[in-house]
C-alpha cells in the first residue's frame, strides 16, 4: 500500500500582472468525500499558510472571500491560481492535500512549485 502522492510543477513564472497558476494533483489511497487543499510558502525554514480551501468531491473549490487564491477542482486534480504577487513573493509554494472525511484522515504534500515573480517596469512618462 503506497502513501498518498501529491504532484505539482517544479517551476512557474507569474504573469506581468502578478498571477501564477499551477495544477496540484493527488493519488488518493481512500475514497474521500471531503478534501482540504492548502498552499503554503516555504522561505528558509519558515512555512506560512497562503490560503486554504475545503471541498466536497464533485463540488467546486471555494476559498474565503478575502483569499488571494482561487481554484477549480476536477476529481483528484486542483487548478490553483494565486493573485497579487510581487517580486518579494518569489519562493517555494507547497501544495498540501488532506483527506478529511470519511476516516481515516490522510496527509500528502507536494515537493513545491518555485514561483518566480518579476515586478513590471514602470511605464515611462510620455512627452507629447
Amino acid at each position: 500500500c503506497k502513501a498518498m502522492h501529491v504532484a505539482q510543477p517544479a517551476v512557474v513564472l507569474a504573469s506581468s500582472r502578478g498571477i501564477a497558476s499551477f495544477v496540484c494533483e493527488y493519488a488518493s489511497p481512500g475514497k474521500a468525500t471531503e478534501v482540504r487543499v492548502t498552499v503554503l510558502r516555504q522561505a528558509d525554514s519558515q512555512v506560512t499558510e497562503v490560503c486554504a480551501a475545503t471541498y466536497m468531491m464533485g463540488n467546486e473549490l471555494t476559498f474565503l472571500d478575502d483569499s488571494i487564491c482561487t481554484g477549480t477542482s476536477s476529481g483528484n486534480q486542483v487548478n490553483l491560481t494565486i493573485q497579487g504577487l510581487r517580486a518579494m513573493d518569489t519562493g517555494l509554494y507547497i501544495c498540501k492535500v488532506e483527506l478529511m472525511y470519511p476516516p481515516p484522515y490522510y496527509l500528502g504534500i507536494g515537493n513545491g512549485t518555485q514561483i518566480y515573480v518579476i515586478d513590471p517596469e514602470p511605464c515611462p512618462d510620455s512627452d507629447f
Epitope: 500500500c1 502513501a3 498518498m4 516555504q42 512555512v47 499558510e49 478529511m100 484522515y105 500528502g108
Partner: antibody, heavy 119, light 107 residues
Framework: QVQLVESGGGVVQPGRSLRLSCAAS????????MHWVRQAPGKGLEWVAV????????HYADSVKGRFTISRDNSKNTLYLQMNSLRAEDTAVYYC????????????WGQGTLVTVSS | DIQMTQSPSSLSASVGDRVTITCRAS??????LNWYQQKPGKAPKLLIY???SLQSGVPSRFSGSGSGTDFTLTISSLQPEDFAAYYC?????????FGPGTKVDIK
C-alpha cells in the same frame, strides 16, 4: 512564543466525567490541527484524538471512541477534551499538542495534566 | 490502522557510543515519521521530523533516515544527557500511532 497550558485534571471515580482544557497562545489557532496525547504511569505515549481547523472534523483512537469528545473554541483559542464513562485505564498524564502546519509533527507540547480514575 | 514497531525496546550504552534505534510502519507512510525524546516527569521533545529533518536547537549528533516503512534514529556519540526514552510516531494517517518506545540507559 507558542504556549499550550492544560487544566482540568484531577481524581475522579470510574464511570464519572471530566473536562480538560488547553489554552493556546502565540500562533494562529485555527490554522492548526490540535491533538490530545496521553501517557499512563510507566507506559508509552498514546495518541487520543485530533480536531482540525474549524472544528468540523475530528478523529479518535479506538480506545476512547464513543466516550471522549474533542472540541475547540477558535474565538477563545482553547481546546477541550470531554471525558465520559471514565475507566481505570484512562489514568494518565494528558498532553495538549499542536500539529505542525506542513507535516503534522508535534513541535509544541503542553506541560500535561494528570487524570486519575480511582474509586 | 498503521502499526508502529520499534527495536530494541531497551538498550544499555556508554558515553561516546554510537546508538541506532529502528522504527517500522506496517504500511508506507512516505516520510511522515517523527522522533521524540522523553525524560522522566517531562513532556516529550521533538528531535527529528519528516524522517530526517533536525528540529531547531537539537544537537547534530542526532540524525534520522528512512522512508516508506523503515526508519532509523542515530545518535553518533552518546552524551550523558541523552539517556532517556525515544519514541517514533507517524503523522501520515489517523490514528497517529507512536512506537512503543526505546529506553536508553547507562551500561
Amino acid at each position: 512564543q507558542v504556549q499550550l497550558v492544560e487544566s482540568g485534571g484531577g481524581v475522579v471515580q470510574p464511570g464519572r466525567s471530566l473536562r480538560l482544557s488547553c489554552a493556546a497562545s502565540g500562533f494562529t489557532f485555527n490554522s492548526y490541527g490540535m491533538h490530545w496525547v496521553r501517557q499512563a504511569p510507566g507506559k508509552g505515549l498514546e495518541w487520543v484524538a485530533v480536531i482540525w481547523y474549524d472544528g468540523n472534523n475530528k478523529h479518535y483512537a479506538d480506545s476512547v471512541k464513543g466516550r471522549f469528545t474533542i472540541s475547540r473554541d477558535n474565538s477563545k483559542n482553547t481546546l477541550y477534551l470531554q471525558m465520559n464513562s471514565l475507566r481505570a485505564e484512562d489514568t494518565a498524564v494528558y498532553y495538549c499538542v499542536r500539529g505542525d502546519i506542513l507535516t503534522g509533527y508535534y513541535g509544541y507540547w503542553g506541560q500535561g495534566t494528570l487524570v486519575t480514575v480511582s474509586s | 490502522d498503521i502499526q508502529m514497531t520499534q527495536s530494541p525496546s531497551s538498550l544499555s550504552a556508554s558515553v561516546g557510543d554510537r546508538v541506532t534505534i529502528t522504527c517500522r510502519a506496517s504500511q508506507s507512510i512516505s516520510s511522515f515519521l517523527n522522533w521524540y525524546q522523553q525524560k522522566p516527569g517531562k513532556a516529550p521533545k521533538l528531535l527529528i521530523y519528516a524522517a530526517s529533518s533536525l528540529q531547531s536547537g537539537v544537537p547534530s549528533r542526532f540524525s534520522g533516515s528512512g522512508s516508506g516503512t523503515d526508519f532509523t534514529l542515530t545518535i553518533s556519540s552518546l552524551q550523558p544527557e541523552d539517556f532517556a526514552a525515544y519514541y517514533c510516531q507517524q503523522s501520515y494517517s489517523t490514528p497517529f500511532a507512536f512506537g512503543p518506545g526505546t529506553k536508553v540507559d547507562i551500561k
